[in-house]
């Protein structure tokens, strides 16, 4: 399930095998003490905050071409807002975004705190070059977090770590289908800490989820279910504070 | 190459019961689902509903929830379809088709199909 | 259930000709249409799969067309060895479901 890759290398089209200009940033920088790339909060970047501090503002971790650096768009978790506060990239030079939907800025939750268990509407759908942006923090001796794609009553894609299963931590993905779950796949290395911080990237591709964590590449999950336009809601839950939940096409 | 193997056709006599495999090889049998259909003759097909042989789950077209039940027999990569209460109703062709992952999705590969008569 | 109403239900040509067979939907079930073609005493074979897409192995003289609820399905330049029954089966929904059928016969 997983790759041997770095995201920096699948998104900026070395060693990907159906390179699409992704932006280049995603996945190659340091994670800092916090989690987050480049620093622990306050100030991974110059202006910013933890999420939720700045309504309107870009995450932490932001960079060229990822949510809020579309010019007047809101950030990730404004639906619909102002366009990006201070500390989001400034927007020159940016790729604009191709495919189904218009280059329009991240779409979702509002900014600050939300209850748990979360959905977020993907009306559409979801289609490639989709870029689904989950921020949060996870609470103190959490037992599991669950990101669940779902079709109907189907779930396309259950991102599920967990954190304490059979005194292990894993993260299990999967598909259930007309109520019946199929084959496990499992993935050992877990970027998740009770207590910190935590940004979760789902980039819809052809083929499959990419998922990446803290913007380090984590794990990639072919589709089972083939009709992405019918993939209609995120449900997200578990041992988490939820700070936003948005989707930007890149 | 997916090969879809059934078994032989069946003469049965009404409100008996019979019960049709189909024997998989070539691919993952798990992995797909197996689908059953039924041409009665002369006229279209009909879908009965599938097996998800990972786990045994199973759906059904809800016409036939109350005569098709499927069962699998992951050791011999075998699906089975038992027909009850039998009526001339049921005397029909019946394939089984290998599926997508996805229940909804086209069949690629059929049986070769199975002919069950119900007579006195 | 989703209903499909396929047209005609016979048609004979000539070889060489043009064979357009229709499948309508009850409800939009989007581009999942798929075209089957069976001959007599074998299993139905698959053409053509969700999204128009022909399959492997198929000749390029059969296509299809169409999304929501109005499908069409093209044989350009008919030949003898196409005579057999034609099915749409709409993979949208639950329980899956086929047309009626087209029988196609040469002159």
């Known amino acids: 399930m997983a790759d041997n890759f770095s995201l920096h290398d699948a998104l900026s089209g070395s060693g990907n095998p159906n390179p699409q200009g992704w932006p280049g940033a995603w996945g190659n920088q340091p994670a800092g003490a916090g989690g987050y790339p480049g620093a622990s909060y306050p100030g991974a970047y110059p202006g910013q905050a933890p999420p939720g501090a700045y309504p309107g503002q870009a995450p932490p971790g932001a960079y060229p071409g990822a949510p809020g650096a579309y010019p007047g768009a809101p950030a990730p978790g404004v639906y619909p807002g102002p366009p990006s506060g201070p500390g989001a990239y400034p927007s020159s030079g940016q790729p604009s975004a191709t495919g189904a939907y218009p280059a329009t800025g991240p779409y979702g939750a509002p900014a600050g705190p939300l209850i748990v268990p979360y959905n977020l509407p993907l009306p559409g759908g979801v289609v490639p070059r989709m870029l689904i942006t989950i921020l949060g923090t996870v609470k103190p001796n959490a037992n599991r977090i669950a990101l669940d794609f779902q079709r109907g009553n189907d779930v396309a894609f259950h991102f599920n770590p967990r954190f304490n299963e059979n005194n292990r931590r894993v993260i299990v993905c999967n598909t259930k289908l007309d109520n019946n779950w199929g084959r496990e796949e499992r993935q050992s290395v877990f970027p998740f800490e009770s207590g910190k911080p935590f940004k979760i990237q789902v980039l819809v591709e052809p083929d499959h989820f990419k998922v990446a964590v803290n913007d380090a590449h984590l794990l990639q999950y072919n589709h089972r279910v083939k009709k992405l336009n019918e993939i209609s809601k995120l449900g997200i839950s578990g041992d988490i504070d939820l700070t936003s939940a948005s989707y930007t096409m890149i | 190459e997916v090969q879809l193997q059934q078994s032989g056709p069946e003469l049965v006599k009404p409100g008996a019961s019979v019960k049709i495999s189909c024997k998989a090889s070539?691919?993952?049998?798990?992995?797909?689902?197996m689908h059953w259909v039924k041409q009665s003759h002369g006229k279209s097909l009909e879908w009965i509903g599938y097996?998800?042989?990972?786990?045994?789950?199973?759906g059904y077209n809800q016409k036939f929830k109350s005569k098709a039940t499927l069962t699998v027999d992951n050791s011999s990569s075998t699906v089975y379809m038992e027909l009850r209460s039998l009526t001339s109703e049921d005397s029909a062709v019946y394939y089984c088709?290998?599926?997508?992952?996805?229940?909804?999705?086209?069949?690629?590969?059929w049986g070769q199909g199975t002919l069950v008569t119900v007579s006195a | 259930e989703i209903v499909l109403t396929q047209s005609p239900a016979s048609l004979s040509v000539t070889t060489g000709e043009k064979v357009t067979i229709r499948c309508i939907t009850s409800i939009d079930i989007d581009d999942d249409m798929n075209w089957y073609q069976q001959k007599p005493g074998e299993p139905p074979k698959l053409l053509i799969s969700e999204g128009n897409t022909l399959r492997p192995g198929v000749p390029s003289r059969f296509s299809s067309s169409g999304y929501g609820t109005d499908f069409v399905f093209t044989i350009e330049n008919t030949l003898s060895e196409d005579v057999a029954d034609y099915y749409c089966?709409?993979?949208?929904?639950?329980?899956?479901?086929f047309g009626a059928g087209t029988k196609l016969e040469l002159k």
């Open positions: 070539g691919n993952t049998f798990t992995d797909h689902n």
């Open positions: 089966l709409q993979s949208d929904n639950k329980p899956l479901t």
């Open positions: 088709a290998r599926g997508e992952y996805d229940y909804l999705a086209w069949f690629a590969y």
């Open positions: 097996i998800y042989p990972y786990n045994g789950g199973t």
